[in-house]
């Protein structure tokens, strides 16, 4: 039985050229996290954090994605094309798979506010 819940940074906005932290947090379960996948709106994988071997950043994102903090991901040098949905997928044992959603809006404005509230989708 899956008792856990994924908390995410929800809907966030950030400035073009800037950076943003994508963060998910798994709570209310004692399951062991074996792997966390970070996926972009077009379903392309950005990065994977494996419990045994660490972070793998996909080559296409190597220069713009930094691991962490924690199991989160930092997107750098943001472009307008980065606007869209991002998904964290927690592979756990024995529970199975948990998935969280974040919507990122990249703004042209130099006064773009970066909101980062935690919410349960």
């Amino acid at each position: 039985m899956m008792t856990g819940t994924i908390e995410t940074t929800g809907n966030i906005s950030a400035k073009k050229g800037g950076s943003v932290i994508l963060q998910c947090h798994l709570s209310s379960t004692m399951a062991q996290v074996t792997q966390v996948n970070w996926e972009q709106h077009d379903h392309s994988l950005l990065a994977i954090r494996n419990a045994e071997l660490g972070w793998h950043i996909y080559p296409a994102f190597k220069d713009r994605v930094a691991p962490g903090p924690g199991l989160g991901l930092t997107l750098q040098s943001l472009t307008m094309n980065d606007t869209g949905e991002y998904f964290c997928t927690y592979h756990t044992y024995p529970d199975g798979t948990y998935r969280g959603r974040i919507f990122l809006e990249v703004l042209e404005s130099s006064v773009a506010e970066h909101s980062a509230r935690f919410q349960i989708p």
Partner: antibody
Framework: EVQLVESGGGLVQPGGSLRLSCAAS????????MDWVRQAPGKGLEWVGR??????????EYAASVKGRFTISRDDSKNSLYLQMNSLKTEDTAVYYC???????????????????WGQGTTVTVSS | EIVLTQSPGTLSLSPGERATLSCRAS???????LAWYQQKPGQAPRLLIY???SRATGIPDRFSGSGSGTDFTLTISRLEPEDFAVYYC????????FGGGTKVEIK
Amino acid sequence: EVQLVESGGGLVQPGGSLRLSCAASGFTFSDHYMDWVRQAPGKGLEWVGRTRNKANSYTTEYAASVKGRFTISRDDSKNSLYLQMNSLKTEDTAVYYCARGQYYYGSSSRGYYYMDVWGQGTTVTVSS
Amino acid sequence: EIVLTQSPGTLSLSPGERATLSCRASQSVRSSYLAWYQQKPGQAPRLLIYGASSRATGIPDRFSGSGSGTDFTLTISRLEPEDFAVYYCQQVGPPLTFGGGTKVEIK
């Protein structure tokens, strides 16, 4: 050409120290995990430890048999890997190999890890 | 620590024969983290198979790997003179461990 060349082996007394080096060429060194593996005379392969890549903050892991005595480090600017061996014991006598760790994921989330490039080895003899 | 047990310790065969090498793990291993290496006297190990069944670059198709969970197999369909060597399986762990090796010798 992708290549690894070890150096620094030799004869050392029990309790002594030795530093091995591994010079890498032909690939982007900073992207890769790097492992040390040893082989005692007439015996099988034994993993010594590894250093992860820049994306993983160069964290290190060690086999229980060397933990606390051996230290792995790297200098990406010199494409070099090192193994500092302290408090050496006679059972550390072996050929020491450095190897490139290939850690990656394909289009699926199926991860792979293996050592695809090996150096020729350097011999360490611990004897009084 | 996951212990890998290879059998047999020595395999005596003639060129042209089929070689079947076994690697058994003390607990389940992800197949994508299982590799096989070949080592000849005085040489460094050479990667043959990764991910339990994928051949490394430049490895002839007479070499094949299979298995999952705790039981893995390396098969050499027709032994060539250059295939007589010691073969090791390896898993990631942690810690990373090798099997004790199987020596394939000329009968």
